[in-house]
């Protein structure tokens, strides 16, 4: 058993038939000695009586608030959860495998540049008595800063016949250079917290894998003279790292119809101007990647040909 | 220590032509290694990352872009700092900045060298013949050093009497190979910079 | 299995005009660019235009611009392309290839040998 | 137009070794690089698109690296039925222009 926070204790369960659980003690918070009663969440049923009481935890029934009393007041309460381990792996039923980049990965996270910001989401189909806590530092052993901000509900989608929930976190490192080598990862953990039920997530990323920019801006077009050629132009995203000249993009431009099996002209260039042959009821697309560290590349940027 | 006295090419930059072949070669080969190494720890998650010019050069500090001298996190390491106060680096000569920067890359480029020299031999060793280092990648490292065109006391190849482990040395060339390829990131970056300049 | 057959082999005088067609089988005409190449005996590849069948829409390599026209028939999903003022430098295999993709090719002709003599 | 330059022009080769032919582009093409195999009597057969994207059907001994001017073709052991002509076709801009074509032959 540890603590999670003042008053809420995780207690850690080989989770299989007839396991024989944990014996759990727990102290009443309270200069009083004698008069002191238990209880378990809503009931009234005493549970024992006396400074501690001694319970045998193997289920989620035997888990929850319990409560000590004297004379019908209050006196302290201690929260315990549940973390389930099943044949040495502990349990992920809180959130969905979002089996992106490889399976099992239950975080996802992005930078748009290389300022230390980066955001994190996660999936789940839980809709209510759900809590997230992030935690994040760079490296482990000597963990650097990094400040998370709390969780949020960021979308919601219909999938099939279920809701899914996405939550995100944005989190920047507190003294972040854009310039630097990183040699320790950032680590992400996350805590997740389902009624009863306990389980943490954790990611292990550098920032220069998880760059992501943003769409180019300011796409513009310029057909040229007797031509079916157009030169397309662009200006790097505001959100990406500065000076452009150090932190380089390279861009990948595209000619396509509406549907993705249809023909198109695509051309990758350094430059922020690309010449393309434009089709009717065609658009052109520009996405962006980092020129000299091949990390993903950004959502399209799109203008019709018309 | 004296760094040595850089007489850089006035037009910069077939430098940045061999920096981008560089970063290609290192790349190519760092793909390769981990193809040929699939069942050693060769991934970015499973190898230590290790820089073996730490406290040696200050490659990162000394070729940052003045528009990030004024980021304190990008200041605080900084052994071989040519910036004594927050806003004078207009008043020092940008040659001498960037004097300092280029040496540093060819001391870089030097320790890798050596140890890839040394790692190599290695390897030629190995009964399996598993890997051996691209030539064309010790050849560019070689051009990038001559277009850099730098004076330095040659450092002498390591050589080993005991018997090498092959195992532990595709482990170590996993490691090399990882940092170079982040450091070849940041010569390309600085190249590409210093020819926009 | 997308397909392209050529029209058998020329013999042209200097100064005359060939016509070689290139029928599509296999995927929809009209949703690939076709692009026309020749190479001459022992030597490299050259590009000279691409056209989109789809609305005719045509691109020529300057070396050809004026001497060379390309077609497109998607009731036959049949090219052509067509050169005029042969001489004999024009003596060459002639390949047509296509691609969903403008700037290369992924799928050629057998070829069409042109020779050009007097 | 853009001159692509070849070399070597003939590359003699051992079977299963190894064999690179170079490609260089008269200005900077990005990645906009693509190698063709062209067996006598035959029409070329896409291997690479975009200097290093891999194209279905083709062994994965054959692969492709470089962008800017300079482009590399590798093929990590030579078989018997890889003793053919090369070519690359820059697609940066228009005209599309090929390498002159190196011929790997048997050594």
């Known amino acids: 058993i540890w603590e999670l926070k003042k008053d809420v204790y995780v207690v850690e369960l080989d989770w299989y038939p007839d396991a024989p659980g944990e014996m759990v003690v727990l102290t009443c918070d309270t200069p009083e000695e004698d008069g002191i009663t238990w209880t378990l969440d809503q009931s009234s049923e005493v549970l024992g009586s006396g400074k501690t009481l001694t319970i045998q935890v193997k289920e989620f029934g035997d888990a929850g608030q319990y409560t000590c009393h004297k004379g019908g007041e209050v006196l302290s309460h201690s929260l315990l959860l549940l973390h389930k381990k099943e044949d040495g792996i502990w349990s992920t039923d809180i959130l969905k495998d979002q089996k992106e980049p490889k399976n099992k990965t239950f975080l996802r996270c992005e930078a748009k540049n290389y300022s230390g910001r980066f955001t994190c989401w996660w999936l789940t189909t839980i809709s209510t008595d759900l809590t997230f806590s992030v935690k994040s530092s760079r490296g482990s052993s000597d963990p650097q800063g990094v400040t998370c901000g709390a969780a949020t509900l960021s979308a919601e989608r219909v999938r099939g016949d279920n809701k899914e929930y996405e939550y995100s976190v944005e989190c920047q490192e507190d003294s972040a250079c854009p310039a630097a080598e990183e040699s320790l990862p950032i680590e992400v953990m996350v805590d997740a917290v389902h009624k009863l039920k306990y389980e943490n997530y954790t990611s292990s990323f550098f920032i220069r894998d998880i760059i992501k920019p943003d769409p180019p801006k300011n796409l513009q077009l310029k057909p040229l003279k007797n031509s079916r050629q157009v030169e397309v132009s662009w200006e790097y995203p505001d959100t990406w790292s500065t000076p452009h000249s150090y932190f380089s993009l390279t861009f990948c431009v595209q000619v396509q119809g509406k549907s993705k099996r249809e023909k198109k002209d695509r051309v990758f260039t350094d430059k922020t101007s690309a010449t393309v042959i434009c089709r009717k009821n065609a658009s052109i697309s520009v996405r962006a990647q980092d020129r000299y560290y091949s990390s993903s590349w950004s959502e399209w940027a799109s203008v019709p040909c018309s | 220590r004296n760094l040595p006295v850089a007489t850089p090419d006035p037009g910069m930059f077939p430098c940045l032509h061999h920096s981008q072949n560089l970063l290609r070669a290192v790349s190519n080969m760092l793909q390769k290694a981990r193809q040929t190494l699939e069942f050693y720890p060769c991934t970015s998650e499973e190898i230590d990352h290790e820089d073996i010019t730490k406290d040696k050069t200050s490659t990162v500090e000394a070729c940052l872009p003045l528009e990030l001298t004024k980021n304190e996190s990008c200041l605080n390491s900084r052994e071989t700092s040519f910036i004594t106060n927050g806003s004078c680096l207009a008043s020092r000569k940008t040659s001498f900045m960037m004097a300092l920067c280029l040496s540093s890359i060819y001391e870089d480029l030097k320790m890798y060298q050596v140890e890839f020299k040394t790692m190599n031999a290695k390897l030629l060793m190995d009964p399996k013949r598993q890997i051996f280092l691209d030539q064309n990648m010790l050849a560019v490292i070689d051009e990038l050093m001559q277009a850099l065109n730098f004076n330095s006391e040659t450092v002498p190849q390591k050589s080993s009497l005991e018997e090498p482990d092959f195992y532990k040395t595709k482990i170590k060339l996993c490691i090399l190979l990882h940092a170079f390829r982040i450091r070849a990131v940041t010569i390309d970056r600085v190249m590409s910079y210093l020819n926009a300049s | 299995q997308v397909q392209l057959v050529q029209s058998g082999a020329e013999v042209k005088k200097p100064g005359s005009s060939v016509k070689v067609s290139c029928k599509a089988s296999g995927g929809t005409f009209s949703d690939y660019y076709l692009h026309w190449s020749r190479q001459a005996p022992g030597q490299g590849l050259e590009w000279m235009g691409w056209?989109?069948?789809?609305?005719?829409?045509?691109e020529y390599a300057p070396k050809f611009q004026g001497r060379v026209t390309i077609t497109a028939d998607e009731s036959t999903s049949t090219a052509y392309m067509e050169l005029s003022s042969l001489r004999s430098e024009d003596t060459a295999v002639y390949y047509c290839a296509r691609n969903k993709e403008l700037r290369y090719i992924d799928v050629w002709g057998q070829g069409t040998l042109v020779t050009v003599s007097s | 137009d853009i001159v692509m330059t070849q070399s070597p022009l003939s590359l003699p080769v051992t079977p299963g070794e190894p064999a690179s032919i170079s490609c260089r582009a008269s200005?900077?093409?990005?990645?906009?690089l693509h190698w063709y195999q062209q067996k006598p009597g035959q029409q070329p057969r896409l291997l690479i698109a975009f200097a290093s994207q891999s194209i279905s059907g083709v062994p994965s001994r054959f692969s492709g690296s470089g962008s800017g001017t300079d482009f590399t073709l590798t093929i990590s052991s030579l078989q018997p039925e890889d003793f053919a002509t090369y070519y690359c076709q820059q697609s940066n801009s228009f005209p599309l222009t090929f390498g002159q074509g190196t011929k790997v032959e048997i050594k």
């Open positions: 056209i989109d069948p789809e609305n005719g829409d045509t």
């Open positions: 200005q900077s093409i990005s990645i906009n």
